[in-house]
Amino acid sequence: AMHVAQPAVVLASSRGIASFVCEYASPGKATEVRVTVLRQADSQVTEVCAATYMMGNELTFLDDSICTGTSSGNQVNLTIQGLRAMDTGLYICKVELMYPPPYYLGIGNGTQIYVIDPEPCPDSDF
């Protein structure tokens, strides 16, 4: 299996944005790569977002995706937006080298993203 590295822990910003790098050790010269972000919480795994891209080009997520990203060589910089405290969990980076054959699959150990909802601003008495 292809090795995929990602940070162990990331803290989301107060605006609910978390970014992390997913790096893969490519055994071949892939031209088309698919990156999927999976969320694992309470032993349930769900797909957060996925994008296919050409090496050297931008990642294209669906318009309604909460993810954006850029690629550079064998690194993918992923950003997940709109996160709330309930979204805290393990976010796993899955990389597939699709074309040309052969196919390679790599799954990272996951990045624990902590999301803390901002405290509401107290009402001001003037």
């Epitope: 031209t31 088309e32 296919t52 891209y53 050409m54 699709m98 074309y99 040309p100 054959p101 052969p102 196919y103």
Partner: antibody
Amino acid sequence: EVQLVESGGGLVKPGGSLRLSCAASGFTFSDYGMAWVRQAPGKGLEWVSFISNLAYSVYYADTETGRFTISRDNAKNSLYLQMNSLRAEDTAVYYCARSGLPYAMDYWGQGTTVTVSS
Amino acid sequence: DIQMTQSPSSLSASVGDRVTITCRASQDISNYLNWYQQKPGKVPKLLIYYISRLHSGVPSRFSGSGSGTDFTLTISSLQPEDVATYFCQQGRMLPWTFGGGTKVEIK
């Protein structure tokens, strides 16, 4: 039910051109790579070309590189093969096939016959 | 290119017989080996992919095995509807290549 229907074959003189089409239905076309495979009369199967689901990746057999162009229109659920500078050895039944992992052709159309002859 | 060599090129067997077709790749193709069935005058159909996984709707009398460069398609009990030409195909590297085919007939 997965259905692939080819059209566009016919008789053409050497050096001529043809454009094959393949209309797909019964599955989400934009989720799958597609391939063209041909079979000369009484012969075996020969892979011709492949295009990935979003058309990011396109590949051809060596003998077709520069002469054939594969393309797709995901909005129309259609696959195409533009064939130029046709030769007698291109005479065959051309099949369009759906291609998912592991680089296998899991569903095939009924084929369209291309005859190159003077 | 990876060459795929099938043997035998043709065979004749009785209904109920166990039939074995072999396919040899010119280099290691890992598990990217697929088998197709083409009945006379018909379109090829995927039988087996990833060496041994049956495609949907394929009877369990068909099975595949092998690894690396040597692979086998087995029909455990030949039926009249199995009369066809069988092709192996490698998906390990481009160009994807097929074996020459094995024509199976009933005695």
